[in-house]
């Protein structure tokens, strides 16, 4: 398990932009955290290339990643979330090039879920409901949701509604009748801690009554 | 798999320096943390320092100004020099692995003794 | 430094028989860990981050606490699990062991 490389592959490694992103998951496995870190030009090699954090930690000074094919990784519950970690690009012992980031500035939350859309006939409204991990945790608990919706014929004519609970109520006469829709959300940290866009959650498809047709509940299709 | 074997003298006249050495196999040292660890009857475990994978070392204050750990990564080895020893720094000495979790990979470990 | 101080010192139990030993920390510390020794060998991991137990370790085995506070529990004695057992704490430096727990069959 040598981290070496030939003194030919140092130089040309040194050639190659080996800008890198990373994010962090609070939580994300009962008590564990993780931080998924990955280049930004997919064509980089890493054959001989390492990512290890060193600071702010609790317990060790320094961890390095798992490799699990493009991306490399780290699953574990010793983050401090206080102060800035050193994030570095290795060969061997020689670091390329590193990035100081605070772990609590770059969360993305897990994609939210149990997606539906429940039709109020007397209301004449439309009740969307899901549910998020982040109610239960810790850390990560206050998030803002960005709900989209677009009827299915149009491709990218998406409507987006950001809010901060997990129910929306869509008003019938906003919508198209007898229109087949499409609907799925997705969060971002909202209070203290920073970040990213979580994945979006599966799709929900509705289908709008007819006007003067009494529905009750909309069935997913 | 993952082992790691200390070497060194087994005995050393009082005042002189212990060095010792940790060979590993099965883990690539520049990604992973080795910390020296003694054992003697009177004094238990005590935890002598570490060195980290980026090369930075932190010493037991105990001993830190007699104590040096390196590393030559290319032969897979970790390095211990403690200068002026004397007789209660007899011991068994072990390196391990500071893993992610604990000391989670030690050494056999190697006897040395004080004395003239 | 953080003083780990564990009792009993030395313990005799019989088969089938709970056990418990105690670590207690001069100062708050994040996580305890647990080696077990056996006399002419190294220590082995065996309870990690306070509770997690090693990989092989039987799950009659526990550990518990937070704090200053912390224990390794056998839920029922084997013959096997007599040895020294010793608490560690890498929350601040220099990190300490615990003065031992031997363990003897009854």
């Known amino acids: 398990e040598s981290g070496y490389a030939q003194n030919g592959d140092l130089e040309d490694a040194e050639l190659d932009d080996y800008s890198f992103s990373c994010y962090s998951q609070l939580e994300v496995n009962g008590s564990q955290h993780s931080l998924t870190c990955a280049f930004e030009d997919p064509d980089v090699n890493i054959t001989n290339l390492e990512f290890e954090i060193c600071g702010a930690l609790v317990e060790v000074k320094c961890l390095n990643f798992r490799k699990l094919q493009e991306i490399y990784f780290i699953e574990t519950k010793k983050f401090l979330l206080i102060g800035k970690s050193n994030i570095c690009v290795k060969v061997g012992e020689k670091s390329l090039t590193c990035k100081k980031i605070d772990l609590t500035t770059i969360v993305k939350p897990e994609a939210p879920f149990d997606l539906s859309v429940v039709y109020r006939e007397g209301a004449n409204d439309f009740v969307v409901t899901f549910n998020t991990s982040h109610l239960q945790k810790k850390y990560v608990k206050v998030l803002m949701h960005d709900v989209a919706y677009r009827q299915e014929k149009d491709e990218n004519k998406w409507t987006h509604v950001n809010l901060s609970s997990t129910k929306l109520t869509l008003l019938q006469r906003k919508l198209q009748p007898a229109a087949m829709y499409e609907i799925k959300v997705r969060s971002i940290p909202d209070h203290y801690f920073k970040g990213f866009w979580s994945e979006w959650s599966p799709s929900y498809y509705f289908r709008t009554p007819e006007i003067n047709n009494s529905s009750g509940e909309m069935d997913p299709i | 798999q993952v082992q790691l074997k200390e070497s060194g003298p087994g005995l050393v006249q009082p005042s002189q320096t212990l060095s010792l050495t940790c060979t590993v196999s099965?883990?690539?040292?520049?990604?992973?943390?080795i910390a020296w660890i003694r054992q003697s009857p009177g004094k238990g475990l005590e935890w002598m320092g570490v060195?980290?994978?980026?090369?930075?070392?932190d010493y037991n204050s105990a001993i830190r100004s007699r104590l040096s750990i390196s590393r030559d990564s290319s032969k897979s080895q970790v390095f211990l020099r403690m200068n002026s020893l004397q007789s209660e720094d007899t011991a068994m000495y072990f390196c391990?692995?500071?893993?992610?979790?604990?000391?989670?990979?030690w050494g056999q470990g190697v006897v040395v003794t004080v004395s003239s | 430094e953080i003083v780990l101080t564990q009792s009993p010192t030395t313990m005799a139990a019989s088969p089938g028989e709970k056990v418990t030993i105690t670590c207690r920390a001069s100062?708050?510390?994040?996580?305890m860990h647990w080696f077990q020794q056996k006399s002419g060998s190294s220590p082995k991991p065996w309870i990690y981050?306070?509770?997690d137990l090693a990989s092989g370790v039987p799950d009659r085995f526990s550990g518990s606490g937070s704090g200053t506070s912390y224990s390794l529990t056998i839920s029922s004695m084997e013959a096997e699990d007599a040895a020294t057992y010793y608490c560690?704490?890498?929350?601040?430096?220099?990190?300490?062991f615990g003065g031992g727990t031997k363990l003897e069959l009854k």
């Open positions: 060195i980290w994978s980026n090369g930075d070392t």
């Open positions: 099965g883990l690539s040292l520049p990604n992973n943390n």
């Open positions: 560690l704490q890498r929350s601040s430096y220099p990190r300490t």
């Open positions: 391990a692995r500071e893993g992610m979790t604990t000391l989670d990979y």
């Open positions: 981050d306070s509770s």
């Open positions: 100062s708050s510390v994040s996580y």
